[in-house]
Amino acid sequence: APVRSLNCTLRDSQQKSLVMSGPYELKALHLQGQDMEQQVVFSMSFVQGEESNDKIPVALGLKEKNLYLSCVLKDDKPTLQLESVDPKNYPKKKMEKRFVFNKIEINNKLEFESAQFPNWYISTSQAENMPVFLGGTKGGQDITDFTMQFVSS
């Protein structure tokens, strides 16, 4: 069976939207009005992995681009990257672990924990127009809570 996917946008808990500022550059900033059209639309695929009531494994691709968020160990540190893939082979139900995030719902907020690196989360900075990154702390300066907005296909 084909993998189930939905289109969505994400905003962090400070209401910053995610935008592409270059081919491999995902940044978070406040958008208003017409500028909201700039925000990235994700194709969130529901993939194989450890699942529970509040934890669902997903892959986050960029809609109509052959790019996925992935987590790799780079110089001994878990690192978030946008990775090019062959569109003929993706998305798929059994995604490589680096592409998998545990979507965790807590109090109507979402966290995205790396399946490859437990306790590392998709994060944004308090500051404007900074890159989205993989952070190893929750509840600190950096933001790990998001809301999801559904986008019709």
């Epitope: 500022s21 270059g22 081919p23 550059e25 992935s70 780079k74 990257q81 990775e83 900074m130 990154f133």
Partner: antibody, heavy 116, light 112 residues
């Protein structure tokens, strides 16, 4: 303040190799894509190569594909360009730049001269 | 091989408005090409003016603006000044498998 300091240039014979380095400071290096751009005397800039944050995706200008390799060490805040099989037409000032599309205050660059 | 095209030269009167363009030898420029604009004066390193179509780099005066006009990227200078006399280069990302970026040949702008 963003600072990018290129080094490793020099005079090399055709067919030779050089490894350029770029020491970055003033920003969180590991969260940015990076690139190399060069400029030959009297010519416009030429984008050479780019690399994403984790090193998993790279791109190269057609003129250097198969000869140059871009890499990075996030723990050292350093970007590299390994240049093999150098040709006279590779003679240029080489700049490293923050972001894939080189959106940065550019440094002073490092001069590479390929000549016999 | 796709070539990035720019007007070789352009002139503008002080205080006037000029629009420089950046196109592709085949196809249209879109925001997915992440157009960038760079200014260079002789003997200096290039300076980034605009990135990602229409974002001004820090410290760049508001008289410089970027956009997509028809099938090209455009750099508009409103209220040109004498020190805007420079070479202007655009750069485009080529997403069609090559995964690289390409600079145009540049436009020499004269303010007279």
């Amino acid at each position: 303040e963003v600072q990018l300091l290129e080094s490793g240039g020099g005079l090399v014979q055709p067919g030779g190799s050089l490894r350029l380095s770029c020491a970055a400071s003033g920003f969180t290096f590991s969260t940015y894509a990076m690139s190399w751009v060069r400029q030959a005397p009297g010519k416009g800039p030429e984008w050479v190569s780019g690399i994403n944050t984790g090193g998993g995706s790279t791109g190269y200008a057609d003129s250097v594909k198969g000869r140059f390799t871009i890499s990075r060490d996030n723990s050292k805040n350093t970007l590299y360009l390994q240049m093999n099989s150098l040709r006279p037409e590779d003679t240029a000032v080489y700049y490293c730049a923050k972001d894939w599309m080189a959106t940065t205050p550019w440094g002073q660059g490092t001069q590479v001269t390929v000549s016999s | 091989q796709t070539v990035v095209t720019q007007e070789p030269s352009f002139s503008v009167s002080p205080g006037g408005t000029v629009t420089l363009t950046c196109g592709l030898s085949s196809g249209s420029v879109t925001t997915n090409n992440y157009p960038g604009w760079f200014q260079q004066t002789p003997g200096q390193a290039p300076r980034t003016l605009i990135y990602n179509t229409n974002n001004r780099h820090s410290g760049v005066p508001s008289r410089f603006s970027g956009s997509i006009l028809g099938n090209k990227a455009a750099l508009t200078i409103t209220g040109a000044q004498a020190d805007d006399e420079s070479d202007y280069y655009c750069a485009l990302y080529m997403s069609s498998g090559s995964n690289n970026a390409v600079f145009g040949g540049g436009t020499k702008l004269t303010v007279l």
